[in-house]
Amino acid sequence: CPGACVCYNEPKVTTSCPQQGLQAVPVGIPAASQRIFLHGNRISHVPAASFRACRNLTILWLHSNVLARIDAAAFTGLALLEQLDLSDNAQLRSVDPATFHGLGRLHTLHLDRCGLQELGPGLFRGLAALQYLYLQDNALQALPDDTFRDLGNLTHLFLHGNRISSVPERAFRGLHSLDRLLLHQNRVAHVHPHAFRDLGRLMTLYLFANNLSALPTEALAPLRALQYLRLNDNPWVCDCRARPLWAWLQKFRGSSSEVPCSLPQRLAGRDLKRLAANDLQGCAVATGPYHPIWTGRATDEEPLGLPKCCQPDAADKASVLEPGRPASAGNALKGRVPPGDSPPGNGSGPRHINDSPFGTLPGSAEPPLTAVRPEGSEPPGFPTSGPRRRPGCSRKNRTRSHCRLGQAGSGGGGTGDSEGS
């Protein structure tokens, strides 16, 4: 057993060396080790084949070190590895795309708070067993096409707290089992209409605290299992362009946050969901360049770079081109709400608004989710009063789900040392 470590055999063969000031992976780790704990040291480099002898290794914790470089072959031979925690290594910045190849049993990968600026092509190739992927609180600016294509069993994808500016068409291809997608606290301004095409099992989507002024309802259409949606803290433009989203939200039976309008000024701060259809008229034009919303339609429908509903009548150009002018009736949505997007009848009455971190709680929906934020940060715009919680229960043996974002009773005790529920 290495000098700075403690080694024991029961209940799992373990080499434990946390917070020992180690500057390198120690030599002499017992080959029979099933768990290796090296967190909280000063390790800056993981050389090739560092753990090659440890064929039975299932858990490797290297979090909270000063890793700056991981050789591409660092984890060679670890065919049984299930948990790999590399988080809290802010100097890492990049990972060779071959680093995780061969880890066919890996189901939990922590890469959060690693200063990652990009995800190299093929980084997650072959990780067919992966269920939990932590990429939050990095410096990612883009989601390359097909990055997660091989992750057919992934259920939790954490991407919040990055610098992602758009969600392209192929970003989430292959994620057929995804249950929770956390994209909050990024810079997302555009979501491609087909970005969520493969996410038929998605139950939780967090897009709050981004730069969204609109969201194509075509993107939401494939989300048949969606229960929890958070869209607050975005600069929503509540004009004719918001009509489809408004209609979709009226029909959504899950739990959703408020969708506070930024523009037009007369609707600033109002919740899109609580507006009437005829509030969404005209085109609010912000100062500065207009950023077109991806619609998937031919550009000849948008000759001015504006959605069709914003194309001015000849006598009404000023209301489009001059910010601050009131919208005229002639600039309302031409025709009616698009087919299939008509609002429901008034049978259910107004929805109950819960606190913004939790969202709207319609009577038929499961209880809403809690807010999740990077550690130590304060939430944006938390309310100071208002309805908050339901009466208590005594379901005393519910096990928490892996990240405690799931539905009631969704978690299980887990087996072995697996991190999933």
């Epitope: 959060d112 954490f158 928490r400 009631a408 005790g413 887990g414």
Partner: antibody, heavy 125, light 107 residues
Framework: QMQLVQSGAEVKKPGASVKVSCKVS????????IHWVRQAPGKGLEWMGG????????VYAQKFQGRVTLTDDTSTDTAYMELSSLRSEDTAVYYC??????????????????WGRGTMITVSS | DIQMTQSPSSVSASVGDRVTITCRAS??????LAWYQQKPGKAPKLLIY???RLQSGVPLRFSGSGSGTDFTLTINSLQPEDSATYYC?????????FGQGTRLEIK
């Protein structure tokens, strides 16, 4: 700096009820998950109940079910724990505590990171 | 309910020593375990969460490890101010349960 400020010590008779307050300062209660833990003299820590942020509901330990009620007043940022039908064995220090997990990122690590100073409740005839 | 069992129930050690306290869960709790330090007349203080994550402001001589059912809290180079009672707590499900505590005394 967030703090949890609890109400003062009380002496109660058996069969009575007591209501302990826990005021949040430096934050808003609606953004927190507050739990209650008690400690009898010379004994260990015992979890009584708290806000389960996953299910958006208050959960109680079975031992206290029906006797304890956890409420809050978000207008004053104050959480309350009321324990009824007091017995001598309820003599203890009662703590409120914030669940760290409510603030963490996707990992959702739970633990009680900020505690009140405790409120001594003595049950004696 | 998940039972948490700590050992030893008390330990006496000298300044500079290395002390290890173990906590065993009656069923698999993955890595969802926290460690607290409590001094007489004071509220508990969080040391470690998620088995191995050091809470902000806690000295580096404290470390935690383990997963599944067995966990350890290690204090390297014991200091006089470490005299206290230490508790583990599972955070895997409700009800949250604590170990019975380990009293650490400085010789």
């Amino acid at each position: 700096q967030m703090q949890l400020v609890q109400s003062g010590a009380e002496v109660k008779k058996p069969g009575a009820s007591v209501k302990v307050s826990c005021k949040v300062s430096g934050y808003t209660l609606s953004g927190l998950s507050i739990h209650w833990v008690r400690q009898a003299p010379g004994k260990g820590l015992e979890w009584m109940g708290g806000f389960d942020s996953e299910d958006d509901e208050t959960v109680y330990a079975q031992k206290f079910q029906g006797r304890v009620t956890l409420t809050d007043d978000t207008s004053t940022d104050t959480a309350y724990m009321e324990l009824s039908s007091l017995r001598s064995e309820d003599t203890a220090v009662y703590y409120c505590a914030r669940d760290l997990g409510y603030l963490t990122s996707g990992n959702y690590y739970d633990a009680f990171d900020i505690w009140g100073r405790g409120t001594m409740i003595t049950v004696s005839s | 309910d998940i039972q948490m069992t700590q050992s030893p129930s008390s330990v006496s050690a000298s300044v500079g020593d290395r002390v290890t306290i173990t906590c065993r869960a009656s069923q698999d709790i993955n890595r969802w375990l926290a460690w607290y330090q409590q001094k007489p007349g004071k509220a508990p203080k969080l040391l470690i969460y998620a088995a191995s994550r050091l809470q902000s402001g806690v000295p580096l001589r404290f470390s935690g490890s383990g997963s599944g059912t067995d966990f350890t809290l290690t204090i390297n180079s014991l200091q006089p101010e470490d005299s206290a009672t230490y508790y583990c707590q599972q955070t895997n499900n409700f009800p949250r349960t604590f170990g019975q505590g380990t009293r650490l005394e400085i010789k």
